[in-house]
């Protein structure tokens, strides 16, 4: 993976009392913004836990890995990283935990080499549909992004502006078909109740998808069919009750897939029979011997792989004439 390392050597630190001046002049090649640490040898700039309220204007042109974590940025405006000359080498940008609640259209424009972006642990109440595509064209220029990390970006309930959070995130992922080259997408810990059905079909290059620790109840309307290159699908710690035949067949048809299903409240009734049969045969599911029933009560903690058809019954549905009030 291309993750930036934090073991950069020979950092030079800017004197903390220097003001970060906005200047039309390009920064000096060896200049380091106030409150940041820079290593030209490692092409890395770290402005970490400094309570910055805006992106420094005087970032050195050599920066390849930029850490802006643990700040108070609040808003990323359009062209937040646009510089003259541009930050042409910036490949990995980490903005996690920086109190961002708004990312505007074109926030990441003019970063031609940006491969990896981490916005995790920010309460993104307002993520523009064009945050990643940069424009509202129906087909945008392809984004260079390959890894997009959006774990725990769900805002508090009262800040969600009366709209679907899932819908807002998906709109940003799909706008302009700009993210067709995305290989890793992490959306863990976002309280997702559902996955909009069109999202995966438009991300054909995905190799790793992390949807763990959400509240997904069903995958019935989600299609994995076109994700030929998908290698890992993390669905741990959701609210999945059962996987139905269509989903099972699609997953089995992906040549490299490994699926992680731990800690879901599996309902072990007659609807579970197909999944149990599949689990016994498949090599797709990692740690399948750890999967246990949560419901009904009589089946709690039973291992799915140890069940047979006689164990999986449904209470008969009484005809209306026999139902009591």
């Amino acid at each position: 993976s291309s993750s930036p390392t934090s073991s950069a050597s020979s950092f030079s630190s800017s004197a903390p009392f220097l003001a970060s001046a906005v200047s039309a002049q390009p920064p000096l090649p060896d200049q380091c913004p106030a409150l940041c640490e820079c290593s030209e040898a490692a092409r890395t700039v770290k402005c970490v836990n400094r309570n910055l309220t805006e992106v420094p204007t005087d970032l050195p042109a050599y920066v390849r890995n930029l850490f802006l974590t643990g700040n108070q940025l609040a808003v990323l405006p359009a062209g937040a990283f646009a510089r003259r000359p541009p930050l042409a080498e910036l490949a990995a940008l980490n903005l996690s935990g920086s109190r961002l609640d708004e990312v505007r259209a074109g926030a990441f424009e003019h970063l031609p080499s940006l491969r990896q972006l981490d916005l995790s642990h920010n309460p993104l109440a307002d993520l523009s549909p064009f945050a990643f595509s940069g424009s509202n064209a129906s087909v945008s220029a392809p984004s260079p992004l390959v890894e997009l990390i959006l774990n725990h970006i769900v805002p508090p309930e009262d800040e969600r502006q009366n709209r679907s959070f899932e819908g807002m995130v998906v709109a940003a992922l799909l706008a302009g078909r700009a993210l067709q080259g995305l290989r890793r997408l992490e959306l863990a810990s976002n309280h997702f109740l559902y996955l909009p059905r069109d999202v995966l079909a438009q991300l054909p290059s995905l190799r790793h998808l992390d949807l763990s620790n959400n509240s997904l109840v069903s995958l019935t309307y989600v299609s994995f069919r076109n994700l030929t290159h998908l290698e890992s699908l993390h669905l741990e710690d959701n609210a999945l009750k059962v996987l139905h035949n269509g989903t099972l067949a699609e997953l089995q048809g992906l040549p490299h897939i490994r699926v992680f299903l731990d800690n879901n409240p599996w309902v072990c009734d007659c609807h579970m029979a197909d999944m149990v049969t599949w689990l016994k045969e498949t090599e797709v599911v990692q740690g399948k011997d750890r999967l246990t029933c949560a419901y009904p009560e009589k089946m709690r903690n039973r291992v799915l792989l140890e069940l047979n058809s006689a164990d999986l019954d449904c209470d008969p549905i009484l005809p209306p004439s026999l139902q009591t009030s």
């Epitope: 491969r115 080259g181 290989r183 190799r207 040549p255």
Partner: antibody, heavy 118, light 113 residues
């Protein structure tokens, strides 16, 4: 320490067989694709075969039918079984790990030498 | 059969020179940018320099750069250093309905003038 180390090379007669091993350490084989690449004396690099994290296998057209790649995730081992060996298979054989995101060989072993001669 | 052709096959240059090596693929590489460059010194394993056509691998000096897309790619060394004299290989990754295929160029030997 993350590394791969090849072994199993040696002298073999034409028509014979040999199994090369690659020991992976510091990472989980189930999460990475692994490949074999060879280099004949004084020649360039030549891709041989690759095995995906879950075990799917792919081969150079000339290697199909004679060479078989396999692995044991729990032991951290990748293997290349070579049958019906010919003089032109004489080479240094490298084991290489593939990046988890990009399709590039980002970790190489030092190679093991195979000599096919009578 | 996919073929990667590097040019030149060999070249002589001096310390401080700017050097360019090209790599042409008979088919487009996967996603138009799955092209890597490696450096190999005698008796040693290859070392990854550039991946994804233009992304510098960790620890590689910035005098190395890569460009290109689809079938035509370039490796540039902006100012040759003594340790850069070696053989350079391009490598493409390809995907079709029948699966994955990888190929290397024949190599470019960079020698001291």
């Amino acid at each position: 320490e993350v590394k791969v180390e090849e072994s199993g090379g040696g002298l073999v007669q034409p028509g014979g067989s040999l199994r090369l091993s690659c020991a992976a350490s510091g990472f989980s084989l189930s999460s990475y694709w692994m490949s074999w690449v060879r280099q004949a004396p004084g020649k360039g690099l030549e891709w041989v075969s690759i095995i995906a994290g879950r075990g799917s296998t792919y081969y150079a057209s000339w290697a199909k039918g004679r060479f078989t790649i396999s692995k044991d995730n729990s032991e951290g081992m990748v293997y290349l079984q070579m049958n019906s060996l010919r003089a032109e298979d004489t080479a240094v054989y490298y084991c290489a790990r593939v990046s988890s995101i990009y399709y590039t060989f980002n970790l190489w072993g030092q190679g093991t030498t195979v000599t096919v001669s009578s | 059969e996919i073929v990667l052709t590097q040019s030149p096959s060999s070249l002589s240059a001096s310390v401080g020179d700017r050097v360019t090596i090209t790599c042409q693929s008979s088919q487009s590489v996967y996603s138009n940018n799955e092209l890597s460059w490696y450096q190999q010194k005698p008796g040693k394993a290859p070392k990854l320099l550039i991946y994804y056509a233009s992304t510098l691998a960790s620890g590689v000096p910035s005098r190395f750069s890569g460009s290109g897309s689809g079938t035509d790619f370039t490796l540039t060394i902006s100012s040759l250093q003594p340790e850069d004299f070696a053989t350079y290989y391009c490598q493409g990754s390809y995907y079709s309905g029948s699966g994955w295929y990888y190929a290397f160029g024949q190599g470019t030997k960079l020698e001291i003038k």
